[in-house]
């Protein structure tokens, strides 16, 4: 059951070594702090991953989606689950790993010329004029006047990065573009193999900050080159 997954609420991560308080998240990947598991004092790497409760896909990382871990899914706690690779079953785009999308219940590669049109069709069909739902989710970020809070702050609607405050860039978030934080050292970044392929992303990441470049993480050994994790690293 889900309770056993969460082990009676004992999602006990070690205190953050890199901030986390005062509105700053800790370093995303590079520090990979140990995680303290309930009932034991073992430090374990981030690969033995602790369940992360979520309400929506956007709360999860780029390689995850939000769902109930039990088949059939009770209406209780949902957690971030690993994204589905190509040819795996899916119910919505967010379930598929980056570079893939959900078509006819299967994750397929987005490296296809017709993909962009298809995504835009899906968005148009789902939202019509009232921007109500996508993939069964309740109201998403909209372009209404409500979104224009302090100009250029995180989450503000933008057209280009110059619209955003320092330390933020303008990146795609569903069908709109919003100001998101420029990536810091160790954070996951997107390395585009094909020119223009960033147009396919529903959740676009910012670029790496000054003095950093997006490179394959050295210790990230995976079978296929294409699925290797890229992080922002010092030049």
């Amino acid at each position: 059951t889900l309770n056993s997954v969460l082990n009676s609420n004992a999602i006990k991560n070690l205190p953050p070594p890199l901030g986390g308080a005062a509105g700053h998240p800790g370093s995303a990947v590079s520090a990979a702090p140990g995680i303290l598991y309930p009932g034991g004092n073992k430090y374990q790497t981030i690969d033995n991953y602790q369940p992360y409760p979520c309400a929506e896909d956007e709360e999860c990382g780029t390689d995850e989606y939000c769902a109930s871990p039990t088949r059939g899914g009770d209406a209780g706690v949902q957690i971030c689950l690993a994204c589905r690779k190509r040819r795996k079953r899916c119910m919505r785009h967010a379930m598929c790993c980056p570079g893939n999308y959900c078509k006819n219940g299967i994750c397929v590669s987005s490296d296809q010329n017709h993909f962009r049109g298809e995504i835009e069709e899906t968005i148009t069909e789902s939202f019509g004029n009232d921007h109500s739902t996508l993939d069964g989710y309740s109201r998403r970020t909209t372009l209404s006047s409500k979104m224009y809070h302090t100009k250029g702050q995180e989450g503000s609607v933008c057209l280009r990065s110059s619209d955003c405050a320092s330390g933020l860039c303008c990146a795609r978030h569903f069908w709109s573009k919003i100001c998101k934080p420029v990536l810091k050292e160790g954070q996951v970044c997107t390395k585009h193999r094909r020119k223009g392929s960033h147009g396919l992303e529903i959740f676009q990441r910012c670029y790496c900050g000054e003095g950093l470049s997006c490179r394959i993480q050295k210790d990230h050994h995976q079978a296929s080159n294409s699925s290797r994790l890229h992080t922002c690293q010092r030049h």
Partner: nanobody, 124 residues
Framework: EVQLVESGGGLVEPGGSLRLSCAAS????????MKWVRQAPGKGLEWVSH????????MYADSVKGRFTISRDNAKNMLYLQMNSLKPEDTAVYFC?????????????????RGQGTQVTVSS
């Protein structure tokens, strides 16, 4: 800059109640699910409760279910946690938090944006 400021903590006897508040600023509050997490002395972060953007759905850890109630006021950019029937094991620093989301490859409580926290002590 994302800012979350918690208040409402204090010393309370077992069985007592407290209401925590969290004032959010620096981001469009209404488009983010929010949560409360806590950290007991010498322990790691522990998830307590979650609420969707519109407040329509809530989730609770087993240890607080039926005793705690999470709510939000999007017009005021405020998040709340009503804590009833408090127990000594609820003693902790309580943080209001928001996910870092798609900036990381895998989400973790450590990567969340959160405030400085408010101390809740349950003791007779």
């Amino acid at each position: 800059e994302v800012q979350l400021v918690e208040s409402g903590g204090g010393l309370v006897e077992p069985g007592g109640s407290l209401r925590l508040s969290c004032a959010a600023s620096g981001f469009p509050f209404s488009i983010y699910p929010m949560k409360w997490v806590r950290q007991a002395p010498g322990k790691g972060l522990e998830w307590v409760s979650h609420i969707t953007r519109d407040g329509g759905r809530t989730m609770y850890a087993d240890s607080v279910k039926g005793r705690f109630t999470i709510s939000r006021d999007n017009a005021k950019n405020m998040l709340y946690l009503q804590m009833n029937s408090l127990k000594p094991e609820d003693t902790a620093v309580y943080f209001c938090a928001r996910s870092a989301g798609k900036v990381v490859s895998r989400a973790s409580l450590e990567n969340d944006y959160r405030g400085q926290g408010t101390q809740v002590t349950v003791s007779s």
